[in-house]
């Protein structure tokens, strides 16, 4: 899905209004110094693609990340603010139920929410001249 | 808890430079911005730029017209900032600030580092 | 660049008193404000952010209100300690601005 056509400041502000605090809520307890971010985005529309990757995709270690609660508020936005993006992610949340399976907090999810913190931080102020 | 210590206060000649350090710790440098503010004595704040100490990426405040260079160095958690060719309306209080958890403010400040430009 | 001009730039109110600040940008910077509070010889202090988010453990007498390009610092029940210079500041556009601040004194 291409990003470019999504309402930013909306997205934003849905970040900032409850996304963000259940991040926080999901990372309490660990060490602000625990992570390094390693994965990083150079402007509003690549950082949606990187967040939406990391939010909803899978990964070695980390299987459950989608349905948490500010992923599925990140997918409600996303489908809000991003003109045709539900249509995209019908088949790969067919997908998505198939593999369900219990919730985990694996240390390597929270290592991808610190991930995520820094991608939406990244999101929230692009270092261009033109955000 | 972050802390930022800023080096000691500076007195430079006209025409000189001054590179003012912040060292970092207690939280992961690389992963927060970095910016520059200064205030100049009895006056209002001013942006200099940031750095994002991960990237290197740096964004400035053209109305240093290039006078301004950021850096950072990962392996000490300390970022620079370097002011040149310095005039008398350079005295300023330089503070360091690290950018909050959503990136859109400022939550940490350094205690300030006093530089006085003098002939 | 942006220009934010708080208003106004001065006031003096009674302890327990209203106190409200206001601050507008020159364009819209949406609701990209921050305010600061400075205390003499000290380094600023993050109060609100992205117009009306306080900022851990800032008192909830504080609160921000706006959007686009009119924002306003509201102190609910003025005290002692709120004596200070306040700042709002936009992160729209770069450069980054702030207004010229508003010195707050008891009444």
């Known amino acids: 899905y291409d990003f470019t056509n999504c309402d930013f400041e909306k997205i934003k502000a849905a970040y900032l209004s409850t996304i963000s605090k259940d991040l926080i809520t999901y990372m309490s307890g660990t060490k602000s110094t625990e992570f390094n971010n390693t994965v990083s985005c150079s402007n509003r529309p690549h950082c949606l693609t990187e967040i939406q990757s990391l939010t909803f995709n899978p990964t070695a270690g980390c299987a459950s990340l989608a349905k948490e609660m500010f992923a599925m508020k990140t997918k409600a936005a996303l489908a809000i603010w991003c003109p045709g993006y539900s249509e995209t992610q019908i088949n790969a949340t067919q997908a998505m139920k198939k593999r369900r399976k219990r919730k985990v907090t694996t240390n390597k999810c929270l290592e991808q929410v610190s991930q995520l913190q820094g991608l939406w931080r990244r999101f929230n102020r692009p270092l261009l001249k033109q955000q | 808890e972050v802390q930022l210590v800023q080096s000691g206060a500076e007195v430079k000649k006209p025409g000189s430079s001054v590179k003012v350090s912040c060292k970092a710790s207690g939280g992961t440098f690389s992963n927060y911005l970095i910016e520059w503010v200064r205030q100049a004595p009895g006056q209002g704040l001013e942006w200099m730029g940031v750095i994002d100490p991960g990237q290197g990426d740096t964004n400035y405040n053209e109305n240093f017209k290039g006078r301004v260079t950021i850096t950072a160095d990962k392996s000490t958690s300390t970022a620079y900032m370097e002011l040149s060719s310095l005039r008398s309306e350079d005295t300023a209080v330089y503070y360091c600030?690290?950018?909050?958890?959503?990136?859109?403010?400022?939550?940490?400040w350094g205690q300030g580092t006093t530089v006085t430009v003098s002939s | 660049d942006i220009v934010m001009t708080q208003s106004p730039d001065s006031l003096a109110v009674s302890l327990g008193e209203r106190a409200t600040i206001n601050c507008k940008a020159s364009q819209s910077v949406s609701s990209d404000v921050t305010w600061y509070q400075q205390k003499p010889g000290q380094s600023p202090k993050l109060l609100i952010y992205y117009v009306s988010n306080h900022y851990t453990g800032v008192p909830d007498r504080f609160s921000g209100s706006g959007s686009g390009t009119d924002f306003t610092l509201t102190i609910s029940s003025l005290q002692a300690e709120d004596v200070a210079v306040y700042y709002c500041q936009q992160h729209h556009r770069f450069p980054l601005t702030f207004g010229q601040g508003t010195k707050l004194e008891i009444k």
């Open positions: 600030a690290r950018e909050d958890n959503t990136g859109t403010a400022f939550d940490y």
